[in-house]
Amino acid sequence: FGISGRHSITVTTVASAGNIGEDGILSCTFEPDIKLSDIVIQWLKEGVLGLVHEFKEGKDELSEQDEMFRGRTAVFADQVIVGNASLRLKNVQLTDAGTYKCYIITSKGKGNANLEYKTGAFSMPEVNVDYNASSETLRCEAPRWFPQPTVVWASQVDQGANFSEVSNTSFELNSENVTMKVVSVLYNVTINNTYSCMIENDIAKATGDIKVTESEIKRRSHLQLLNSKA
C-alpha cells in the first residue's frame, strides 16, 4: 500500500444504539474510491486490542479480529465501492457499548472518525383495556427494556396531570437475567379520552397511545432512539 499517510479523506460516522440480542448497525461513510481493491476498512473499539473487523481487497480479512467479535461482524460488501463502510453487528451484547473508530485507507489517502455506540434493550409498548379489573383500567406492557426505564402516563383531556398516584409500574426480569418486562397499570380511566404510556431510558423513548370511546378502541405505538442522529 503506497499511502504516505499525509493525505486525509473525509470519514463520517453517526452515533447509534444497539438492541441487546438483535442485530445492530455502526454507521460509517467515506469518500469513495474507483477501485474496490484499493479500499481498506478497519473497525476498532476502544479498550479492545484486536480488530473489530477488517475488509480489504474486496473481502473480509479476519485474521486479526478480536475474539469478542468473532462471527458477529460484516460490512455491506456491495456498498463499499460507493463509500459505505457501515458495520453490521450480529447479536448485540451489553458489552458492545463503547467508542468505535472507523478507519479508512484508499488510494486517495486515509481518514477516520469515532462513534459512540450505546447498548440496551427497548421495545414497543402495547396499551390495552384491562377488562378483568374492577374499575376502568389500562395496562401498558413492553417486553424488553434495559437499563430500567421510567414510565409516565399522560392524557389528552387532562394535560399536565400527574398520574403517579393512580398508576402502578412493575419490572420483571426476563429469563436471560438482563432485560426486563415493563408492566404499568393506570386506574380510574375515563371514556372518550386518549391516554399515553411513555417508557424512557437513556437509550430510547417509546410511547403507546390508546383512544377509548363508546364504540371503538384505537392504538398507536412509537419508538425513538435518543442521542442518535439516525
Epitope: 500500500f1 499517510g5 476502544e46 479498550g47 486490542l49 486479526e64 478507519y103 485507507i105 486515509k110
Partner: antibody, heavy 121, light 107 residues
C-alpha cells in the same frame, strides 16, 4: 508525573515461579492497555504479553503461552506478570509499558525502569 | 506472526550526518508502526508512532515515513545524544513484534 515502577525480579531456579509487579501512577490506569516486554542480555526487545484496559482481553507471545499470566488490579493501579515453569531462556530485564492511543494502534509511550529476572541453577 | 526486519544492524556515523534506518514487515501493517530509541541500561523511549507522528518531547530532527511493509526512520542531523540502538515495532497484529534493532555508533 506519569510513572511505571516494576518490582519482583530476582534469581530463580529452572522450573520455579516468580511474580512481577508494575505500579502505575499519574494516569487513569484502567483506560490504557498495558504490556510486558523483555530484553535478554545483549539482545533486542521481545514482546511478552498484553492486557486490555478493562483486563478482559489478554495476549501472549508463543514463547510464554501457558506458562505466564498477565493480570491487573485496577483498585491498586498495578499490573502483574505471573511466571511459572521458568526456563534459562526467560532470563532478561522485564519492562512494563503503557500503550498509547485509545484503540491500541499506536506504540508504547511510557516504560518502567525494568526488573531483572535470572533463571539459573 | 509478522516478522520485522531492520537494516542495517549497525552503522557508524559522525555528528551532523543524516542517518536513515529501514524496517520491513513480512506483511502489511498499514501505518501501525512505532520507532524507539534505547540507550545502554535504560528503558526504550518512544520516538515515532503511527509511522509518521512524532511523540511528545522528541526533537524534530527525527522523522518517520512509509506505510504497508516499508518504513524509514531518519535523523536529519545526528547529535551526540543520538548514539543509541533503534527499534521498530508493529502493532497491527496482536503479537506486537519488534525489529532486531539498529545500533548507531560514533565513527
Amino acid at each position: 508525573e506519569v510513572q511505571l515502577l516494576e518490582s519482583g525480579g530476582g534469581l530463580v531456579q529452572p522450573g520455579g515461579s516468580l511474580r512481577l509487579s508494575c505500579a502505575a501512577s499519574g494516569f487513569t490506569f484502567n483506560t490504557h492497555a498495558m504490556h510486558w516486554v523483555r530484553q535478554a542480555p545483549g539482545k533486542g526487545l521481545e514482546w511478552v504479553s498484553a492486557i486490555s484496559g478493562s483486563g478482559g482481553s489478554t495476549y501472549y507471545a508463543d514463547s510464554v503461552k501457558g506458562r505466564f499470566t498477565i493480570s491487573r488490579d485496577i483498585s491498586k493501579n498495578t499490573l502483574y506478570l505471573q511466571m511459572n515453569s521458568l526456563r534459562a531462556e526467560d532470563t532478561a530485564v522485564y519492562y512494563c509499558a503503557r500503550l498509547l492511543g485509545r484503540f491500541g494502534e499506536y506504540g508504547m509511550d511510557v516504560w518502567g525502569q525494568g526488573t531483572t529476572v535470572t533463571v539459573s541453577s | 506472526d509478522i516478522q520485522m526486519t531492520q537494516s542495517p544492524s549497525s552503522l557508524s556515523a559522525s555528528v551532523g550526518d543524516r542517518v536513515t534506518i529501514t524496517c520491513r514487515a513480512s506483511q502489511t501493517v498499514y501505518t501501525w508502526l512505532a520507532w524507539y530509541q534505547q540507550k545502554p541500561g535504560k528503558a526504550p523511549k518512544l520516538l515515532i508512532y503511527d509511522a509518521t507522528n512524532l511523540a511528545t518531547g522528541v526533537p524534530s530532527r527525527f522523522s518517520g515515513s512509509g506505510s504497508g511493509t516499508d518504513f524509514t526512520l531518519t535523523i536529519s542531523s545526528l547529535q551526540p545524544e543520538d548514539f543509541a540502538t533503534y527499534y521498530c515495532q508493529q502493532s497491527y497484529s496482536t503479537s506486537w513484534t519488534f525489529g532486531g534493532g539498529t545500533k548507531v555508533e560514533i565513527k
